[in-house]
Interface confidence: low
């Protein structure tokens, strides 16, 4: 081909390429042709005589201007015609009379201002018509009934000001499952118009100025339909009473979108009318009271979204949110509540109380006073099958005994970035029979006990990144009691003093997590009673990740147990020689990270077994020593390895001797060198 | 106890519709979810779709959504299963399968009915 | 969708054995996976429900492991009646998708 498209698996990409005029000697076998942001102003139908297997063709972003109707006879097979963001203005009967086999109809982004006529009377197969952005007044799309088999119309982004069935009746045999209608000036529904549609499932009103009155009437337009998902956010709906959705109590609606609307009362029994209700949107709203029978009704509701929804007006404090006793007490379904980014007093003592379902809870950053977890705070609770609960950066800094004790079903218990310091005895997590994963990292200090985890044996991953952890060297080990356990993470902690059996019968550990510790005087000959062997037994260990700790020495036989390994970052410390052999049982090894060290010397003894099945090597920045014994083999390996190697051109450069300084080490020329073959 | 007592063996004809009963007893019946369950001989299983018998409320696999149709009479206290359009790949044992109070594993199912698709 | 893949799709052992059937997800189901036991001619049977709790009734030599999107069951020691097809099934969103079946056979 002449032209620069790309053509794999009879897909033609032709797009960006400043492209007058359609290629002509594209294979003819291609069934998706993309044209788009080219400079086309015509789509010659003679042009796609060759391209009679097109099932696929997007020219958007050009600027078409008119459509030829002999296109679609030159394209029998045509299903998607994407032509958004083009300068087509009028669309006749003929336009798309051959398109008879069209399921998606994309014209957004163009300047149609009306529709005469039956434009699309022939698309009996049309599932998606998209016309939002475009200048209609009206939703008449054509005369007579057509488009039955039409599931998705999009009119978003128009000037549409009105509803009315007149128009809506060419739809009389559709089923519509998205009627766009965001970002339109609609002030009026007429009566029946929903009605005039076939049946109507999905319903979009983003961005709409209805506020309550026109809400209302919305609602009662939508009785007795088929709606099952109606969007109104940003409607300046600012309050709901229970005549609001008085309508829908003859729908069955699934999924009600309220968000962005700064809703700021939410009267009692405003939602008694969508018993079959499952999604419910209303973050990002101002709700300054919760009433005990605000969410009444709301049986089915198995999702609910109150993010940002409460949040309060100054900074007196008697202007925060309530949220009475009782108020979730009707949602017996709902098993994913998100209440994040609130400004919430506290937990009441029946807050929860009723949600027999709930799986999910979000309270991060909900709180303005959780300082406290105490053995009530979470009594509502008790009856709700929690698996994952989420409680960060609430500022909380104290967990009193027994404070999940109703929590029986929790997986994972998510308390990072807070502000907790104390000891952990153990009965903090008494109850937490099925806790699986513990996330307690960003937190001011934890100073650790025998007992600390002793409650939870089932725990599989524990997170204590930068915690200032304490005692964490005390024997036995805090960790003794977590043989489940395949994740753990300590770094970040300045630990300076580990004992050789902290992590002792742990043999399901997975990853373990060292980085940014003082850990080099553990490895070092001279310490007192020698080094201290912290990763013995470890035979399932993946990940393991050690970078700045400072070691400057690595003990010969440090890395023995760890058959598994397959990742182990060794980065920014100080290591210069590295004995032999200390990477002779990693034959798994796909991952070594030692960039920032002090290593001058790439030998086949120490570096060839851990080389072997390497995936990915990184040791930038280092000092290499150019010469023949130093890294002739290693030069040889890189050279001839298929080990992903980032920036070896730029930072693997030779320190030493001094006229190789800043020479780039893979061209070190080892042809002098002898006995430098990296693979015998 | 939980019991699940499904319709008869059923021959159709491709082209045409089946529909299968799945009848509960020794529980209540519409506080928990009913799931449909297929499975065609020597192959695994593969889920249709689930029911909340009380409200009709349905969540299909979008590979059976236009073919069938799960409903659910509160009063028989039976949910069933109608595919439409049948063809020879259809040729299955249909299973309805019940959640327990935890909602994440079917303890309860019912025998199968066996459907086979043959001209 | 959420697809399962089980490996192996047959294994055979001998009473007393240990066994291992892995089933990965295509994406994160968290914790909501379940096992069953399916004999020839019968409806599947709960095994495991959340990964790892065992369902009533259930001989402690099945367990089940894992989160995410990798999960295992483990019969410890192979019974006469542990010889059947095993499937996977996760119950994070609809559609609730099986794994493909382990066959379980005697040696």
């Known amino acids: 081909s002449t032209t620069k498209c790309t053509v794999s698996h009879e897909v033609a990409d032709c797009s960006h390429l400043k492209l007058t005029q359609v290629p002509d000697d594209l294979p003819t076998n291609i069934t998706v042709l993309n044209l788009t942001h080219n400079q086309l102003r015509r789509l010659p139908a003679a042009n796609f005589t060759r391209y009679s297997q097109l099932t696929s063709l997007d020219v958007g972003f050009n600027t078409i201007s008119k459509l030829e109707p002999e296109l679609c006879q030159k394209l029998p097979m045509l299903k998607v015609l994407n032509l958004q963001h083009n300068e087509l203005s009028q669309l006749s009967d003929k336009t798309f009379a051959f398109c008879t086999n069209l399921t998606e109809l994309h014209l957004m982004s163009n300047s149609i201002q009306k529709i005469k006529n039956n434009p699309f009377v022939k698309q009996k197969n049309l599932i998606t018509l998209d016309l939002s952005h475009n200048g209609l007044s009206s939703t008449k799309l054509g005369t007579q009934v057509q488009l039955e088999n039409l599931q998705e119309l999009l009119l978003s982004n128009n000037k549409i000001q009105a509803l009315k069935s007149e128009e809506l009746d060419i739809f009389a045999n559709s089923s519509l499952k998205k009627l766009e209608l965001s970002s339109n000036q609609i002030k009026e529904f007429s009566p029946g118009c929903f009605h005039a549609i076939g049946r109507l499932f999905g319903l979009f009103l983003n961005n709409v100025q209805l506020g309550p009155s026109l809400t209302e009437k919305l609602c009662l337009e939508l009785a007795n339909t088929s709606i099952r998902n109606l969007s109104l956010s940003n409607s300046q709906l600012s309050t709901t009473s229970n005549t609001t959705f008085l309508g829908l109590k003859w729908t069955n609606l699934t999924m009600l979108d309220l968000s962005y609307n700064n809703l700021n009362v939410v009267g009692n029994d405003s939602f008694a009318w969508l018993p079959q209700l499952e999604y419910f949107f209303l973050e990002y709203n101002n709700i300054q009271h919760l009433f005990s029978h605000s969410l009444h009704g709301l049986f089915n509701v198995r999702y609910l979204n109150l993010k940002r929804s409460f949040t309060k007006q100054s900074i007196s404090l008697a202007s925060l949110p309530k949220i009475d006793d009782f108020s979730f007490q009707w949602l017996k379904c709902l098993e994913h509540l998100n209440m994040e980014d609130n400004d919430i007093p506290g937990i009441k003592s029946n807050m929860f109380t009723g949600l027999i379902n709930l799986k999910y809870l979000s309270l991060s950053n909900s709180f303005t006073s959780l300082r406290t977890l105490t053995n009530e705070t979470f009594v509502s609770l008790a009856h709700s099958p929690l698996h994952i609960l989420n409680l960060t950066k609430n500022k909380i800094s104290k967990i009193e005994s027994d404070a999940f004790s109703w929590l029986g079903h929790l997986e994972v218990l998510d308390l990072g970035l807070n502000e907790i310091g104390q000891e952990l005895t153990g009965q903090e997590w008494r109850g937490l029979e099925n806790i699986f994963e513990i996330y307690l990292s960003y937190n001011k200090y934890l100073q650790l006990t025998r007992n600390s985890f002793a409650l939870v044996p089932s725990l599989q991953r524990l997170m204590l990144r930068r915690v200032a952890l304490k005692n964490v060297d005390s024997s036995p080990s805090p960790f003794q009691p977590l043989r489940n356990l395949t994740i753990l993470d300590l770094s970040n902690n300045n630990i300076a003093n580990i004992n050789d059996d902290m992590l002792e019968g742990l043999e399901k550990l997975e990853i373990l997590d060292l980085q940014h510790n003082n850990l080099a005087r553990l490895w070092k000959h001279a310490n007192p009673g020698g080094p201290i062997y912290f990763l013995k037994g470890l035979s399932h260990l993946h990940i393991l990740n050690l970078e700045s700790n400072g070691f400057d020495e690595i003990p010969v036989e440090v890395f023995k147990d760890l058959f598994e390994l397959k990742i182990i970052d060794l980065g920014l410390n100080n290591l210069n020689t590295l004995p032999a052999s200390v990477f002779n049982n990693q034959v798994s090894l796909k991952s070594l990270n030692l960039q920032k060290n002090l290593i001058t010397s790439v030998e086949k003894k120490v570096f060839g077994p851990a080389f072997r099945n390497l995936t990915e090597l990184d040791m930038r920045f280092n000092p290499f020593d150019c010469t023949c014994e130093s890294i002739a083999w290693f030069v040889n390996w890189i050279n001839e390895t298929h080990t992903n190697i980032p920036e070896l051109s730029s930072h693997y450069l030779c320190n030493t001797p001094p006229h190789y300084h800043g020479f780039p080490v893979r061209l070190f020329d080892t042809s002098s060198c002898k006995d430098s073959a990296p693979f015998e | 106890q939980v019991q699940l007592v499904q319709s008869g063996a059923e021959v159709k004809k491709p082209g045409s519709s089946v529909k299968v009963s799945c009848k509960a007893s020794?529980?209540?019946?519409?506080?928990?979810?009913i799931h449909w369950v297929r499975q065609a001989p020597g192959q695994g299983l593969e889920w249709m779709g689930e029911?909340?018998?009380?409200?009709?409320?349905?969540n299909y696999n979008e590979k059976f959504k236009t073919r069938v149709t799960i409903t659910a009479d509160e009063s028989t206290s039976t949910a069933y299963m109608e595919l439409s359009s049948l063809r020879s790949e259809d040729t299955a044992v249909y299973y309805c399968?019940?959640?327990?109070?935890?909602?994440?594993?079917?303890?309860?199912w019912g025998r199968g009915t066996l459907v086979t698709v043959s001209s | 969708d959420i697809q399962m893949t089980q490996s192996p799709s047959s294994l055979s052992a001998s009473v007393g054995d240990r066994v291992t059937i892995t089933c990965r997800a295509s994406?994160?189901?968290?914790?909501?996976l379940a096992w069953f036991q399916q004999k020839p001619g019968k409806a599947p049977k709960s095994l495991i429900y959340?990964?790892?709790t065992l369902a009533d009734g259930v001989p402690s030599r099945f367990s089940g492991s894992g989160s995410g999107t990798d999960f295992t069951l483990t019969i410890s020691s192979l019974q006469p009646e542990d010889f059947a097809t095993y499937y996977c099934?996760?119950?994070?969103?609809?559609?609730?998708?099986f794994g493909q079946g382990t066959k379980l056979e005697i040696k």
């Open positions: 099934q996760h119950f994070w969103s609809t559609p609730f998708t």
């Open positions: 994406g994160n189901i968290h914790n909501y």
């Open positions: 020794g529980g209540t019946f519409s506080t928990y979810w």
């Open positions: 029911i909340n018998p009380n409200n009709g409320r349905i």
């Open positions: 959340n990964a790892k």
């Open positions: 399968a019940r959640v327990g109070v935890m909602i994440t594993t079917f303890p309860y």
